[in-house]
């Protein structure tokens, strides 16, 4: 707590300008009026204050706005945003996307801090859903943002927002997240033609069911191995050798290099060896010829 000392004669700040950087901590406290600071917050960011000086300015704003800062002040916080705690931010009501962008810009190039996470949470909750413009903004600053959300949180993403998602935004998503995002993407891109549709849907296919993979295999999509390896194992297992061959097109040769890894390994174990041999890749581990395959899960379902 800074001691309350009288402002020396002639030092009372008439405006927020660069002369203030020569003020000592106690002088800033005594000579800068909080209301003046609030109305001229846009100037603070242009002045190279030290962390000590920013602490004093924050203390002044905290005293002026004990219930939380108004958006007119928040929008111009600039570097002062870095001094805010998550507890401070929880008091805010941020509704403008411009305010969000301005604050994210301050933290640009750094990992998502607890302050930024709280700010985003407050903003999204205030909007009720993760709309396209917000998602556009967030993924531009934090490509991994989408994958940091829980499946429950992702369920509030409207299909229209999916257009803002880039392939790299999904790099760290797990299957549970893709399970939620895939149906939204399918809906969002449903009116596109075959090849364009595949380009857009490809990043989301880790959440695709078997029937959709079968449908894609009829469209000459030439799925690359990296995408195939991210597919759900349970969705790949029922595919026939012919379907996988059609799905991968010229990339089918890549199966050999991946035969010990899931989902390829598990898929091989479910195929007849003579069917696998038709690929001419030397894939081993299929069901030997003459063996009868009983699908016990199907039998259980019937009984």
């Amino acid at each position: 707590e800074v001691e309350k000392t009288a402002c020396p004669s002639g030092k009372k700040a008439r405006e927020i300008d660069e002369s203030l950087i020569f003020y000592k901590k106690w002088e800033l406290e005594a000579c800068v009026d909080a209301a003046l600071l609030a109305t001229q917050m846009d100037r603070v960011n242009a002045i190279p204050f030290t962390y000590e000086q920013l602490d004093v300015l924050k203390h002044k704003l905290d005293e002026l706005y004990p219930q939380g800062y108004p958006e007119s002040v928040i929008q111009h916080l600039g570097y002062l945003f870095l001094k805010m705690s998550p507890e401070d931010i929880r008091k805010w009501n941020v509704t403008s996307l411009e305010t969000l962008k301005a604050l994210l810009e301050v933290n640009k190039g750094h990992e998502m801090s607890p302050q930024v996470a709280t700010l985003i949470d407050r903003f999204v909750k205030g909007r009720g859903q993760l709309d396209k413009d917000t998602l556009d903004t967030l993924t531009a600053f934090y490509p991994g943002y989408l994958c940091s959300l829980s499946p429950e949180e992702l369920s509030s993403v409207p299909p229209s927002s999916i257009w803002a998602v880039r392939p790299q935004d999904l790099d760290t998503c797990d299957p549970r997240q893709l399970d939620v995002l895939y149906p939204k993407a399918r809906l969002a891109f449903q009116n596109m033609n075959g090849s364009e549709y595949f380009v857009k849907i490809q990043s989301f296919l880790g959440g695709a069911p078997t029937e959709d993979l079968k449908a894609l295999s009829q469209q000459n999509v030439s799925m690359d191995l990296a995408t195939f390896m991210k597919l759900r194992t349970d969705a790949v297992l029922p595919l026939t050798v012919a379907e996988v061959q059609k799905l991968l097109g010229p990339h089918v040769e890549g199966l050999k290099a991946e035969e010990r890894h899931r989902p390829v390994r598990d898929w091989i174990l479910r195929q007849r060896q003579d069917d696998l041999d038709t690929l001419g890749l030397g894939l081993q581990g299929g069901i030997p010829n003459g063996y009868l395959v009983l699908d016990l899960s199907m039998q259980e379902a019937l009984s």
Partner: antibody, heavy 119, light 110 residues
């Protein structure tokens, strides 16, 4: 290659003046606060002063007006003007880039230039 | 005035030892503290900033902790190349400062 190179050191008589330079390559000096630090033989690091991105200068309490920091953004060079030199100013002088617009850690250093004050 | 005090001024240790160096600020500097390593005849090198963040390229055996007035630099398993002098520096204020650096701690071979 990102580097800072000091020059201008040497032997100088007590009471005389000397100007050190710090030339930057691979970085734009005007985008950072810059500092001077010195180290007397066998002693620790001693902060001299800093110039922020706006050109405002701040000095350690002991400097007492004898040293002046300046910069020439067109030459991408930082300077330290030293006057009324004494034997105790004998040291290696380093320039350093501050990881901030104002004040913070020094994340890039020059190799140093030796100043010897002796009659 | 803001003053930085380091201890010990020197210590002897062996390869593989866990080494701890402390730095104390005369007033709170929150987490605005950096640590540097300096080898004879060379410029200092930034190891840690903001009390605990590792600078680029610094091995993970170095770690920093603390906030307010008390800070610690720890080397979990001393390596031959770690024998050097270590300095702390406050990055909180540039006014009322006699020296932003601590006095240094020399880590020598036992």
């Amino acid at each position: 290659q990102v580097q800072l190179v000091e020059s201008g050191g040497g032997v100088v008589q007590p009471g005389r003046s000397l100007r050190l330079s710090c030339a930057a390559s691979g970085i734009d000096l005007s985008s950072y606060a810059m500092s001077w630090v010195r180290q007397a033989p066998g002693k620790g690091l001693e902060w001299i002063g800093v110039i922020d991105i706006s050109g405002n200068r701040f000095y350690a309490d002991w400097v007492k007006g004898r040293f002046t920091i300046s910069r020439d953004n067109s030459k991408n060079t930082l300077y330290l003007q030293m006057s009324s030199l004494r034997a105790e100013d004998t040291a290696v002088y380093y320039c350093a880039r501050v990881d901030s617009r104002a004040w913070g850690p020094f994340n890039l250093w020059g190799q140093g230039t030796l100043v010897t004050v002796s009659s | 005035d803001y003053q930085m005090t380091q201890s010990p001024s020197s210590l002897s240790a062996s390869v593989g030892d866990r080494v701890t160096i402390t730095c104390q600020a005369s007033q709170s500097i929150f987490s605005y503290l950096a640590w540097y390593q300096q080898k004879p005849g060379k410029a200092p090198k930034l190891l840690i900033y903001d009390a605990s963040d590792l600078a680029s390229g610094v091995p993970s055996r170095f770690s920093g902790s603390g906030s307010g007035t008390d800070f610690t630099l720890t080397i979990s398993s001393l390596q031959p190349e770690d024998f050097a002098t270590y300095y702390c520096q406050q990055g909180y204020t540039r006014s009322d400062v006699d020296n932003a650096f601590g006095g240094g701690t020399k880590v020598e071979i036992k």
